[in-house]
């Protein structure tokens, strides 16, 4: 998991990190839910979209996101997040050609259609947290995480190490 003592040091390292190549080391389809087991769902049209955080009906299938895992070149000083001491970054795609993006100016999580290579705003550092949860830290704005605010996804600034385990930035990945 993300080390409690290393917030500032890790933040500096993130600024300098770059992604090895343009191909993911692995890809994984998973449903995304909050710490409180609400589902993340996507209502996407060509010109508009909504990202919901909601309780799903019992008979409804959960939306899935395609998580593409990338290895960053910068070695991680923290344990648990990387492969061979390197950080793992992910992109998240709910459907073909669309990816979650961090809009740091608006503190929002957006869906954008784009071609590869993807912009840095589409990359998130993956942190394995407690209770089989993960969190997603913006590559472009270290210390800022995808979180839940008012039943929507938003970018949330985590300014102290104690807040790294706050429930609103914790997510669960499931194959079902």
């Amino acid at each position: 998991a993300f080390g409690i003592s290393g917030v500032q040091k890790y933040t500096r390292a993130l600024h300098d990190s770059s992604i090895t190549g343009i191909s993911p080391i692995t890809e994984y389809l998973a449903s995304l839910s909050t710490y409180n087991d609400q589902s993340i769902t996507f209502a996407l049209e060509d010109e508009s979209y909504e990202i919901y955080v909601e309780d799903l009906k019992k008979d409804e299938k959960k939306d899935k996101v395609l998580l593409s895992y990338y290895e960053s070149q910068h070695p991680s000083n923290e344990s648990g997040d990387g492969v061979d001491g390197k950080m793992l970054m992910v992109t998240l795609s709910p459907t073909k050609d669309f990816w979650l993006h961090a809009n740091n100016k608006e503190h929002s999580v957006e869906l954008h259609k784009c071609e590869k290579p993807l912009p840095d705003q589409a990359f998130f550092v993956l942190h394995n947290m407690h209770s089989n949860c993960v969190s997603f830290e913006c590559k472009t704005d270290p210390g800022v995480f995808i979180g839940v605010k008012d039943n929507h996804l938003a970018l949330i600034k985590v300014d102290s190490s104690e807040n790294l385990c706050t429930e609103n930035i914790l997510f669960k990945l499931s194959e079902t």
Epitope: L29, F42, D59, P94, T95
Partner: antibody, heavy 126, light 106 residues
Framework: EVQLLESGGGLVQPGGSLRLSCAAS????????MSWVRRAPGKGLEWVSA????????YYADSVKGRFTISRDNSKNTLYLQMNSLRAEDTAVYYC???????????????????WGQGTMVTVSS | SYVLTQPPSVSVSPGQTASITCSGE??????AAWYQQKPGQSPVLVIY???KRPSGIPERFSGSNSGNTATLTISGTQAIDEADYYC?????????FGGGTKVTVL
């Protein structure tokens, strides 16, 4: 603007065949599941068939299974319904409909029908 | 096969409230959609995911769904609301429509 334009309807004898087409425009055709829905004279709406955005998955109502084939040509932005062994009870206005939202990776039929064509009449009679 | 049951007809005076029910086994465990169809026209989606209204659909249209019944409510019904209304759910990768309800504005 989303537009769906059906064609190919007409009068056909029982046991005959017909191919319906639905020309789509105004959206990324290959990203959406598409369906055929019909309404027989004096009756209600009946879902007939659906196809995934890639064309890799197809779904049919029991009433048409084995007789109708749904397909799509994403390069032409066109949806098709090949109807064989037609019966009198297949007489209806046939609508093509687009899912409200783009397909998610999980696939399957999940979303409401957000956009409809104007329909094409199929009459099966001797 | 899954069956959705609607009343064949509902009559309402202008300005009054019309309620159309749609019954099915464990209906509340599924998302219900509602479509309006006027004579000679194509169906139009008026409610999806039980309660949500597509853009362009007036606020007088609302929906609910729990138990075994979904309900479409038209508040302050107007003459232009006279039409056939259909509920619909997805079940086992098929679309299932109710039989339809003809709403007459007296």
């Amino acid at each position: 603007e989303v537009q769906l334009l059906e064609s190919g309807g007409g009068l056909v004898q029982p046991g005959g065949s017909l191919r319906l087409s639905c020309a789509a425009s105004g959206f990324t055709f290959s990203s959406y599941a598409m369906s055929w829905v019909r309404r027989a004279p004096g009756k209600g709406l009946e879902w007939v068939s659906a196809i995934s955005g890639s064309g890799g998955s197809t779904y049919y109502a029991d009433s048409v299974k084995g007789r109708f084939t749904i397909s799509r040509d994403n390069s032409k932005n066109t949806l098709y319904l090949q109807m064989n062994s037609l019966r009198a009870e297949d007489t209806a206005v046939y609508y093509c409909a687009r899912d409200l939202w783009m397909e998610n990776w999980v696939g399957g039929l999940r979303y409401p029908f957000g956009y409809w064509g104007q329909g094409t009449m199929v009459t099966v009679s001797s | 096969s899954y069956v959705l049951t609607q009343p064949p007809s509902v009559s309402v005076s202008p300005g009054q409230t019309a309620s159309i029910t749609c019954s099915g086994e464990r209906m509340g465990d599924k998302y219900a959609a509602w479509y309006q169809q006027k004579p000679g026209q194509s169906p139009v989606l008026v409610i999806y995911q039980d309660t949500k209204r597509p853009s362009g659909i007036p606020e007088r249209f609302s929906g609910s769904n729990s138990g075994n019944t979904a309900t479409l409510t038209i508040s302050g019904t107007q003459a232009i609301d006279e039409a056939d209304y259909y509920c619909e759910v997805k079940k086992s990768d098929t679309g299932v429509f109710g039989g339809g309800t003809k709403v007459t504005v007296l």
